[in-house]
């Protein structure tokens, strides 16, 4: 039920990468505006994105307070220019989102290879420890800070002259691999949370190859 000139939001979808979390919905508003509320299972509703004509709302500030909580959002529809107006049931139309647990569900962003250094037949590859918007003691935590040992990185590496890929894994942000002397190698990394059931892997990082700027080389 509700007034004839408002429609309830639908297709409420969480879009979240490295805890940057946006709720999206439909339809594009015609003569109506939206307000979003978010709550934990046991908490009070908090209103966000008041009377907006957007069909998305950035809820990052709320979910980063505790990424292991399970959140629920709802989107209210109001007639444009008359936000006090309610549906015939005495309240605005609204639709609930699916539940969302950031720790379990946020997508892993594309990682970046920070550097690589060759010393003889060893190469040390370092993955950038990306900063998230999760805070503790007034400092922003890195992805590693948040996920700890749940997060691993997989390195794919291959000789520039061939396509046969090798892999290595680490639960830090560094790899130390053996290479053939005199050969140039290319590298790509992927973030993985092996024990997840959904959103287990990131996309692959951009490929970095030896002989380009990122690396350092020291012959022993």
């Amino acid at each position: 039920s509700g007034t004839t000139n408002t429609v309830a939001a639908y297709n409420l979808t969480w879009k979240s990468t490295n805890f940057k979390t946006i709720l999206e919905w439909e339809p594009k508003p015609v003569n109506q505006v939206y307000t979003v509320q978010i709550s934990t299972k046991s908490g009070d509703w908090k209103s966000k994105c008041f009377y907006t004509t957007d069909t998305e709302c950035d809820l990052t500030d709320e979910i980063v307070k505790d990424v292991k909580q399970t959140y629920l959002a709802r989107v209210f529809s109001y007639p444009a220019g008359n936000v006090e107006s309610t549906g015939s049931a005495g309240e605005p139309l609204y639709e609930n989102s699916p539940e969302f647990t950031p720790y379990l569900e946020t997508n892993l962003g594309q990682p970046t290879i920070q550097s690589f250094e060759q010393v003889g037949t060893k190469v040390n590859v370092t993955v950038e420890d990306e900063r998230t918007l999760v805070r503790r003691n007034n400092t922003f935590l890195s992805l590693r800070d948040v996920f700890g040992k749940d997060l691993i990185y997989t390195l794919y590496y291959w000789k520039s002259s061939s396509s046969g890929k090798k892999t290595a894994k680490t639960n830090t942000n560094e790899f130390l691999i053996d290479v053939d002397k005199g050969e140039n190698y290319c590298f790509s990394v992927q973030a993985v949370i092996p024990s997840r059931t959904v959103n287990r892997k990131s996309t692959d990082s951009p490929v970095e190859c030896m002989g380009q700027e990122k690396g350092e080389f020291r012959e022993i």
């Epitope: 934990t40 292991k68 909580q69 399970t70 720790y103 894994k169 639960n171 949370i193 092996p194 024990s195």
Partner: antibody
Framework: EVQLVQSGAEVKKPGASVKVSCKAS????????MNWVRQAPGQGLEWMGE????????TYNQKFKARVTLTVDQSTNTAYMELSSLRSEDTAVYYC???????????WGQGTTVTVSS | SIQMTQSPSSLSASVGDRVTITCKAS??????IAWYQQKPGKSPKLLIY???NRYTGVPSRFSGSGYGTDFTFTISSLQPEDIATYYC?????????FGGGTKVEIK
């Protein structure tokens, strides 16, 4: 179906060592940390340590660090817990448990009773 | 290490009663709390994780709440099969630590 099957009961003399096995099946063994928890008769649960089956890296409860060794055999999907210099207060049921994403122990072995008696 | 204080250590209630167990952490563990059920002679079973999330297949009469240092586990309507010892555990900071347990019996 995820299963953790532990080795049978052991009776040991004080000062000896015991090695308990935990064979995992029904999931990717290297994707989850394996933990060890013990429970003395009539007592609560006490965490001993955990091992990453992918790398073999382990973390121990300081209380047991000098006496416990955790290992894995990836070829047989088996985790091992060895406790040395046994004393009577080590008499307990020892459990292996798979740590789920974020920390909780979702699957447990059936337990192995270790009795230390002279 | 973080100490977990669980209370009461035992309780007796009638079938259908609402049962509440509390767990207090010696420092904030955010939502890093799990609750387990252990029946005599059996391995513990995970019921609740992240303070309030029911694990797969766990009946809806079991629930958890709390944040920071104070947590509550509730059985909304006690059933005969719920006779067991219940443990809280913090999985926020290693070493992982357990509460002392609460033995639940039927009156």
């Amino acid at each position: 179906e995820v299963q953790l099957v532990q080795s049978g009961a052991e009776v040991k003399k004080p000062g000896a060592s015991v090695k308990v096995s935990c064979k995992a099946s029904g999931y990717s063994f290297t994707g989850y940390y394996m933990n060890w928890v013990r429970q003395a008769p009539g007592q609560g649960l006490e965490w001993m340590g955990e091992i990453n089956p992918s790398t073999g890296g382990s973390t121990y409860n300081q209380k047991f660090k000098a006496r416990v060794t955790l290992t894995v055999d990836q070829s047989t999907n088996t985790a091992y817990m060895e406790l040395s210099s046994l004393r009577s207060e080590d008499t307990a049921v020892y459990y292996c448990a798979r740590r789920e994403l974020g920390g909780p122990f979702g699957y447990w072995g059936q337990g192995t009773t270790v009795t230390v008696s002279s | 290490s973080i100490q977990m204080t669980q209370s009461p250590s035992s309780l007796s209630a009638s079938v259908g009663d609402r049962v509440t167990i509390t767990c207090k952490a010696s420092q904030s563990v955010s939502s890093g709390i799990a609750w387990y059920q252990q029946k005599p002679g059996k391995s513990p079973k995970l019921l609740i994780y992240f303070a309030s999330n029911r694990y797969t297949g766990v009946p809806s009469r079991f629930s958890g709440s709390g944040y920071g240092t104070d947590f509550t586990f509730t059985i909304s309507s006690l059933q005969p099969e719920d006779i067991a010892t219940y443990y809280c555990q913090q999985d926020y900071s290693s070493p992982w630590t357990f509460g002392g347990g609460t033995k639940v019996e039927i009156k």
